[in-house]
């Protein structure tokens, strides 16, 4: 019997009846066995077929068989109800071998030409299965030339049988206080040949409760207890199960904080599995009662191990544990049923005693000494000599523990000295230098330090003076002996002040004229304002209207008098402002250099002379009354004049203060 080509040679070829294409002889039997490589099959088709037709092809036939199975018995030329001719059909071996048998009987009624067929090996697609047949692979089937292989979805591993996918379902640990776990793929059928282990591991003190939910379907047996697939539940105390069948198991209260669930499946079956909802319980802690003026969050029916609550205080109250304030408070329930922290208190915020207000006082509005949340206090300044700056002085104790003004300021109000108060009322007439009375010139400052000079108090810690008067002490401010609150130059009764710093106008050049003859002295302490010590006001923008030619200003000081000595008592003189051109002309003739009088100066005095400031008055204020505010302000600073004080046709020259308001304000705000 001729054989087909041996593998690994190419498997393909032609078969034909004996004598083809001539007629075949009687009593012929020919057999071909074709063999393909493993994983291949044989394909066969006929290009010519002409055999004697007989009932059930009993006479002449071609028989195709693969292994023990007959694939076809063929005869005739075309198929009938009971006989089959190949026609255009293609035939396939079931495995890798195909047997072809040709037989003719002892006679033919007429000549028949037989057959011609072609065959070839082709790859078997093992992944394609007939309807109703079990799939080749559990999950994924991959065909290749000569064979196939199986693979699994994520979470599965290929069983050693190379076809089944076992679930990777062990080692899952559940640590939450409640949760759900189920058989793989639930509610779809669970995988075969799998062994699953699930652990529930809660903190000591918890007890796990298991509830089977929805459906339960695990392969069972009518007589034997769960021989195929089963579910077991193990705790450190006992084992529950095995479970199988279709009935939901009852709730299991494990009384344990650790549970191991084992699920084992065999190689067959189609069941949906199970689902467990687990919860936990523990010894409850005492129900937390919120402290007065506080509330508990979250509110729960009960609090067990690991549950927590926080306390929040109402606005204006703060958390207090013992004597210490807390930023926040959270207590946690412990396994022995106690809270890990004692309940705090919500204590009313206390702003504490209000700070003292320099030159002012504080009054408790809500009640004597009441400093708690929403309490009100009222600051006020010492009347007459101080006034409150910006603020209305009303402060409320707010929730942050600060006394806060109606504008939201947490800083103290400021009591500013009232400026320009004088006991003196000015007369319209001009008369000779007079002795000052107490309170007439409370801004007057006596400056001793090499020479005698004067100045005027600004606010409660600045002195305005002439640059030439303090030039020598500009680098040694502490050498200046500053006295105020006295009329008598040599009196031991005065208020002493000391200089912290001297600021000389940067435009002043010593010994080169008196332009910019202005300076400020910062005192190292604030002075207490009273009827004898009061600051002078700085001129308002509108002040020039009170300083026109012939308007009366007042100069005061302890300078040289007509007798040629420094005055023992503070003296003052009322003098009119002189026309600027007139003054400029008076100082244009020798010995005065041209341009001695500048726009930064103003002149005052009588054309006839006799009323003037003099040496020792330098730095003192030439003051004017602002009739709108009824306050005195400094218009000039005693600067220079003729060699002979009070000389006719000559005038006292004063630094024009209104030109220097920005300079003064900048120095004071910066320092």
């Amino acid at each position: 019997t001729p054989l087909g080509p041996k593998w690994p040679e190419p498997v393909f070829g032609r078969l034909a009846s004996p004598g083809f294409p001539g007629e075949y002889a009687n009593d012929q039997e020919r057999r071909w066995t074709l063999t393909a490589p493993p994983g291949y099959r044989l394909r066969l088709y006929f290009t010519h077929f002409d055999l004697e037709l007989s009932h059930l092809c009993e006479y002449d036939f071609v028989k195709l068989s693969s292994g023990a199975k007959v694939l076809a018995t063929l005869c005739g030329q075309e198929s009938t109800d009971t006989e089959r001719a190949p026609g255009k059909d293609t035939f396939y071996s079931l495995g890798s071998s195909l047997d072809i048998t040709f037989r003719s009987d002892y006679s033919n009624e007429k000549p028949f030409t037989g057959f011609e067929a072609f065959y070839a090996a082709e790859d078997i697609d093992e992944c394609q299965v007939a309807p109703g047949e079990a799939p080749t692979c559990d999950h994924h089937c991959h065909n290749h030339l000569g064979g196939f292989y199986c693979s699994c979805r994520a979470g599965y591993v290929l069983h050693r049988n190379k076809r089944t996918c076992s679930a990777l379902c062990s080692g899952q640990v559940f640590t939450q206080r409640s949760g759900e776990l189920s058989s793989p793929e639930y509610p779809r059928p669970y995988p075969k040949l799998s062994s699953c282990t699930y652990s529930i591991s809660l903190e000591e003190g918890f007890s796990v409760i298991l509830d089977f939910v929805e459906s339960f379907d695990v392969e069972t047996h009518p007589e034997t207890l769960c021989p195929y697939d089963f579910l077991k539940i193990q705790t450190d105390r006992e084992e529950h199960g095995p479970f199988c069948g279709k009935t939901l198991p009852h709730r299991i209260e494990t009384k344990s904080n650790t549970v191991t669930i084992t699920f084992v499946t065999d190689e067959s079956g189609d069941h949906t599995g199970w689902k467990i909802h687990y919860t936990s319980t523990a010894q409850p802690c005492p129900y937390p009662m919120a402290p007065p003026n506080g509330h508990v969050s979250p509110v729960q029916a009960k609090y067990i191990l690991k549950d927590s609550f926080s306390i929040f205080c109402e606005t204006g109250y703060e958390l207090l544990q013992g004597h210490l304030p807390l930023k926040s408070f959270t207590a946690v329930c412990q396994k022995d049923g106690s809270w890990d922290r004692p309940m705090p208190a919500c204590s009313i915020v206390d702003c504490g005693p209000p700070d003292d207000l320099p030159s002012g006082r504080v009054e408790y509005i809500t009640g004597p000494g009441v400093t708690t949340y929403k309490a009100v206090i009222q600051y006020s300044c010492e009347e007459t000599f101080y006034t409150m700056k910006v603020n209305d002085g009303k402060y409320v104790c707010e929730a942050d523990g600060f006394w806060t003004s109606s504008k939201g300021e947490k800083s103290l109000p400021v009591c500013e000295p009232v400026c320009g108060l004088s006991a003196r009322t000015t007369g319209g007439r001009i008369y000779g230098g007079q002795k000052a009375k107490p309170g007439d010139f409370p801004w007057q400052v006596l400056i001793l330090g090499g020479t005698t000079a004067a100045g005027a108090l600004l606010y409660d810690n600045w002195v305005l003076t002439a640059a030439h008067a303090v030039y020598e002490q500009k680098h040694d401010a502490s050498a200046l002996d500053i006295r105020m609150g006295t009329l008598k130059r040599l009196s031991p009764h005065y208020t002493q002040a000391w200089s912290e710093a001297v600021f000389i106008h940067e435009g002043y050049t010593h010994d080169a004229g008196f332009d910019n003859d202005i300076a400020l002295i910062k005192l190292n302490n604030k002075v207490v304002i009273n009827s004898n010590i009061t600051p002078i006001c700085l001129p308002r923008k509108e002040a020039e209207s009170f300083m026109r030619t012939d308007d009366i200003g007042t100069a005061s000081g302890w300078g040289l008098t007509q007798r040629g000595f420094l005055a023992r008592n503070l003296m003052y003189v009322d003098i009119p402002i002189v026309d600027h051109q007139k003054c400029t002309a008076a100082y244009e003739k020798p010995p005065y250099p041209r341009g001695s009088v500048t726009a930064n100066m103003l002149c005052a005095g009588l054309e006839s002379g006799g009323k003037d400031s003099c040496r020792g008055d330098s730095g003192g204020a030439l003051v004017f009354l602002d009739s709108e505010t009824e306050r005195w302000f400094v218009g000039g600073i005693v600067s220079w004049g003729s060699m002979n004080c009070g000389e006719a046709g000559q005038y006292g020259v004063y630094t024009k203060v209104i030109n220097y308001i920005p300079w003064i304000e900048n120095i004071i705000s910066d320092f």
Epitope: H323, P325, D350, G352
Partner: antibody
């Protein structure tokens, strides 16, 4: 204005008891608003809280010193005191008394004494 | 008991900003306090309850506390700010101080 002033011996022998007193002026120690504390500072080192007392006698101590420390209060004299037993050279320090507020703005040491130097040496 | 960790030193030029940190486990859950101490003087409270400034303390001193770190910031540092700075907190009614940070104004 409240002021605090420490007083006591500047030299203490090893193993003896250090005793200091803090006198409060300008305010009452019995005011319920404050705690009164002791803090020390070894030479060239940082601050260490020793303990605090309330006018009622409630005390709080540093756990590391608790076995050796006693703080007491004498409201009639407006004073509070520190006793530190079994001293060693490691207890050489400047000892400060200080006030901490009990109400809002509480618990910070807002007023301090000028400190007193205690040397432990034989 | 808490341990508060501060850098030993911080240098800053005049007018610049100095930041001093204080670290401790969950310090942000507690209140932080800051004290300034100049040589030979007693400490002075500059910040209490994380961010609050006692009266008389300049606005250039500010505080912040969150997570594990509290910070004292001195903006526009002046020569007079040169000092040792200590952080402090209360842990279960026990006062705890940091080791201190020396601020040098260059």
């Amino acid at each position: 204005q409240v002021q605090l002033q420490e007083s006591g011996p500047g030299l203490v022998k090893p193993s003896e008891t250090l005793s200091l007193t803090c006198t409060v002026s300008g305010g009452s120690i019995s005011s319920g608003e404050y705690f009164w504390g002791w803090i020390r500072q070894p030479p060239g080192k940082g601050l260490e809280w020793i303990g605090s007392i309330y006018y009622s006698g409630s005390t709080y101590y540093n756990p590391s010193l608790k076995s050796r420390v006693t703080i007491s209060v004498d409201t009639s004299k407006n004073q509070f005191s520190l006793k530190l037993s079994s001293v060693t050279a490691a207890d050489t320090a400047v000892y400060y008394c200080a006030r901490s507020l009990k109400a809002a703005r509480r618990d910070a040491f807002d007023i301090w004494g000028q400190g007193t130097t205690v040397t432990v040496s034989s | 008991q808490s341990v508060l960790t501060q850098p030993p030193s911080v240098s800053v030029s005049p007018g610049q900003t100095a930041s001093i940190t204080c670290s401790g486990h969950k310090l942000g859950d507690k209140y932080a306090y800051w004290y300034q101490q100049k040589p030979g003087q007693s400490p002075v409270l500059v910040i209490y309850q994380d961010t609050k400034r006692p009266s008389g303390i300049p606005e250039r001193f500010s505080g912040f506390n969150s997570g594990n770190t509290a910070t004292l910031t001195i903006s526009g540092t002046q020569a007079t700010d040169e000092a040792d700075y200590y952080c402090q907190t209360w842990d279960s009614s026990t006062g705890v101080f940091g080791a201190g940070t020396k601020v040098t104004v260059l």
